[in-house]
Amino acid sequence: MHSDCIFKKEQAMCLEKIQRANELMGFNDSSPGCPGMWDNITCWKPAHVGEMVLVSCPELFRIFNPDQVWETETIGESDFGDSNSLDLSDMGVVSRNCTEDGWSEPFPHYFDACGFDEYESETGDQDYYYLS
C-alpha cells in the first residue's frame, strides 16, 4: 500500500479509537485532561492530568527504517493496546505527559526514540514528503 494511503487509514482509525476511548472514559469537551489526538505522526489516546501515555513507534518509521526492529509490541489496531506493557527505557517507545496546560511534546522526540539512519535516508525512497 502507498505510504500516503497508510497515513490516511491510520488517521481514520485514530479518530475512531479516540471516539471509543472518550465514551469508555466518560470524556467530553469540558472534561479536565487532554483530548485524544492525531499529531500527524501517530495516535494519542485521551488522558487525565498527571497521566503519561506511552506509544510504540509509529508506522512512519517503518517506512523510514524498513530494516529497524523494535523489541516493543505494536499497539493493536482495534484499540490503544495496553500501554503498561511499554517501558520508556525501551527503544521504540515515545511518551507524552498530560498536564493542566495540555499535552507535553513527545519524549524522546520521535527520531531519538525510533531510530533514524541519516546516511541510508540519502539514497532512500523520496515519496514520503507529501504525506498528510
Partner: antibody, heavy 120, light 107 residues
C-alpha cells in the same frame, strides 16, 4: 555535510513585510522538522517557529503569532519565514536550524543567519 | 510558556578550572533540556541533548545532569576555546524557549 544558508534579510520599515529563505543541503530535507530562531543584536537566542517534515504542523512563539508564517517547499529543499507587520523589536539575526525530528525536535544544525533590521 | 533562568549571568574563570553552569525551568521539562555553545560571530552549536546525553564530536570535558526543573552543564577543565556563551533550551512544551545564556569569560 549539513548546510543551511539563509537569505532575504535587509532593512525594512515598521509595518512592512519581508520573506526569509533557507536553502538546505547535505541531508534529506523532507524528513526533518525545521526551526527559525532569532537573536537581537547583543542579546540571547529566541525561538521563533517550527514546521514539521511535511508542513502539517506549525508552531510559533507568542511574540510572532499572527504576524509570521513558517512554510517549506520540500521539492526545492527550502524553508521560508514570511514576516508581516514588522516592528522595531523584530530586528535580529534570523537563523534557520534543522530540528532532529519529524514533528518538532531540538535544533541540531544551524545556518549562519540573515540580518533583519526594522527601522524608519 | 516555560521560562528558563540561567545562572550565573557571567562566569569568570581561568583555563584549566572547572565551570558549573545552572539552568532552572519554571515548570518541569522532564529531561527535554538541551545545551548550546555560541562563540562571537558564530551560530550556536549543540553540546548536550536530553540533559545528559553526549554527542559525537563534542569533547568529553562537557557533561550535563539534572531533570525536572534543575539542570547543570559542567566543563571539567576549561580549554581556551571554551570561553563562549552557553544557552539551555527546552523542547518539552510549546512554545519552545531558550535561557538568557551564561557567558564564560577569561579571568
Amino acid at each position: 555535510q549539513v548546510q543551511l544558508v539563509e537569505s532575504g534579510g535587509g532593512v525594512v520599515q515598521p509595518g512592512r513585510s519581508l520573506r526569509l529563505s533557507c536553502a538546505a543541503s547535505g541531508f534529506t530535507f523532507s524528513r526533518f522538522a525545521m526551526h527559525w530562531v532569532r537573536q537581537a543584536p547583543g542579546k540571547g537566542l529566541e525561538w521563533v517557529a517550527v514546521i514539521s517534515y511535511n508542513g502539517g504542523n506549525k508552531y510559533y512563539a507568542r511574540s510572532v503569532k499572527g504576524r509570521f508564517t513558517i512554510s517549506r517547499d520540500n521539492s526545492k529543499n527550502t524553508l521560508y519565514l514570511q514576516m508581516n507587520s514588522l516592528r522595531a523589536e523584530d530586528t535580529a539575526l534570523f537563523y534557520c536550524a534543522r530540528g532532529y525530528d519529524v514533528l518538532t525536535g531540538y535544533p541540531d544544525y544551524w545556518g549562519q543567519g540573515t540580518l533583519v533590521t526594522v527601522s524608519s | 510558556e516555560i521560562v528558563l533562568t540561567q545562572s550565573p549571568a557571567t562566569l569568570s574563570l581561568s583555563p584549566g578550572e572547572r565551570a558549573t553552569l545552572s539552568c532552572r525551568a519554571s515548570q518541569s521539562v522532564g529531561r527535554s533540556l538541551h545545551w548550546y555553545q555560541q562563540k562571537p560571530g558564530q551560530a550556536p552549536r549543540l553540546l548536550i541533548k536530553y540533559a545528559s546525553q553526549s554527542l559525537s564530536g563534542i569533547p568529553a570535558r562537557f557533561s550535563g545532569s539534572g531533570s525536572g526543573t534543575d539542570f547543570t552543564l559542567t566543563i571539567s577543565s576549561l580549554e581556551p576555546e571554551d570561553f563562549a556563551v552557553y544557552y539551555c533550551h527546552q523542547s518539552s512544551r510549546l512554545p519552545f524557549t531558550f535561557g538568557p545564556g551564561t557567558k564564560v569569560d577569561i579571568k
